[in-house]
């Protein structure tokens, strides 16, 4: 005897109480695949979780985290506080940027300071964990009476400040 349940599409369940008739999922429940004997309860996004996508008869609700937090896990099962500027998110959580790198945002990764010398410029303002270096004119441009024929002096390492 063929199992009539296999004909029940997503958004329905196979109702054994009614001779295996396909019944629509009740409110606040869903079935994302066909042939299911029960519908799953919709996820509720509450507390630190906010709704990104409402539940439908064929798909679960999707949650996001409230402002200042970001999701962990494929289905946003946990919320983690955004990192501070000068940090990056690692597998173990927020970690300070290593020397020579910076992050001016609360998300993303630490990026290397700009190497001013590659553009023939010098460091005007040293870099920090939160800010990139600021490059200024080349050292040659700064020396009085320097001609444009003068080769640029080697710039010191970007971001290094005297200890």
């Amino acid at each position: 005897l063929q199992d009539l349940c296999s004909n029940c599409p997503a958004g329905t369940f196979c109702d054994n109480n009614r001779s295996q008739i396909c019944s629509p999922c009740p409110p606040n429940s869903f079935s994302s695949a066909g042939g299911q004997r029960t519908c799953d309860i919709c996820r509720q996004c509450k507390g630190v979780f906010k709704t990104r996508k409402e539940c439908s008869s064929t798909s679960n609700a999707e949650c996001d985290c409230i402002s200042g937090y970001h999701c962990l896990g494929a289905e946003c099962s946990m919320c983690e506080q955004d990192c501070k500027q000068g940090q990056e998110l690692t597998k173990k959580g927020c970690k300070d940027c290593c020397f020579g790198t910076f992050n001016d945002q609360k998300r993303g990764i630490c990026r290397p300071w700009t190497n001013c010398s590659l553009d023939g410029k010098s460091v005007l303002v040293n870099g920090t964990k939160e800010r990139d270096v600021v490059c200024g004119p080349s050292p040659a441009d700064l020396s009085p009476g320097a001609s444009s024929a003068t080769p640029p002096a080697p710039a010191r390492e970007p971001g290094h400040s005297p200890q």
Partner: antibody, heavy 116, light 107 residues
Framework: QVQLVQSGAEVKKPGASVKVSCKAS????????MHWVRQAPGQGLEWMGA????????DYNQKFKDRVTMTRDTSISTAYMELSRLRSDDTAVYYC?????????WGQGTLVTVSS | DIQMTQSPSSLSASVGDRVTITCRAS??????LNWYQQKPGGAVKLLIY???RLHSGVPSRFSGSGSGTDYTLTISSLQPEDFATYFC?????????FGGGTKVEIR
């Protein structure tokens, strides 16, 4: 800083009710679910349920469903857990905890002793 | 309900020892596993969440790993302040459930 401060210890007779409070400070109270966990003497931790302060919606552990009531007063950033028809095996420390999918901040605990 | 089985229930160790505590779930909890520390006074603190993420202020000697049903808390070099009871807890499904706890005592 984020803090949860609970009400003081209680001694109750069997059959009575107890209401424990948990006052939140240092964050937006309505933005995070508050959970309640208890620990009987020498035992492990047992989840009792949770309340969404924004809506007042609750989720209870089936074990306590007919005896527990969780409420909140958003005007004073306080959550409450009331347990009725107390028995001697309800003697425990009751904790509130803020939820992010994990309990990042816990109250100091409230000892409830049920004794005749 | 998801059952959480923690082992050992107690252990004796010395300062400087490497300590490993395991937690097994009765079904796949997809890394939704947290670890807590409880000192004798009763205060409970979050150590690790989402299997391996260190809560702010927790020393780096604590680490977590695992997937599926099997998870581990490791203390790389036990310090005097680490003598306490440790609990795992799953956040995969309601009701949230905890392991039975592991008491770490001084040898």
């Amino acid at each position: 800083q984020v803090q949860l401060v609970q009400s003081g210890a209680e001694v109750k007779k069997p059959g009575a009710s107890v209401k424990v409070s948990c006052k939140a400070s240092g964050y937006t109270f309505a933005g995070f679910e508050m959970h309640w966990v208890r620990q009987a003497p020498g035992q492990g931790l047992e989840w009792m349920g949770a309340i969404d302060p924004k809506t007042g919606g609750t989720d209870y552990n089936q074990k306590f469903k007919d005896r527990v009531t969780m409420t909140r007063d958003t005007s004073i950033s306080t959550a409450y857990m009331e347990l009725s028809r107390l028995r001697s095996d309800d003697t425990a420390v009751y904790y509130c905890a803020r939820d992010l999918g994990y309990f990042d901040v816990w109250g100091q605990g409230t000892l409830v002793t049920v004794s005749s | 309900d998801i059952q959480m089985t923690q082992s050992p229930s107690s252990l004796s160790a010395s300062v400087g020892d490497r300590v490993t505590i395991t937690c097994r779930a009765s079904q796949d909890i997809r890394s939704n596993l947290n670890w807590y520390q409880q000192k004798p006074g009763g205060a409970v603190k979050l150590l690790i969440y989402y299997t391996s993420r260190l809560h702010s202020g927790v020393p780096s000697r604590f680490s977590g790993s695992g997937s599926g049903t099997d998870y581990t808390l490791t203390i790389s070099s036990l310090q005097p302040e680490d003598f306490a009871t440790y609990f795992c807890q799953q956040s995969e499904k309601l009701p949230r459930t905890f392991g039975g706890g592991t008491k770490v005592e001084i040898r």
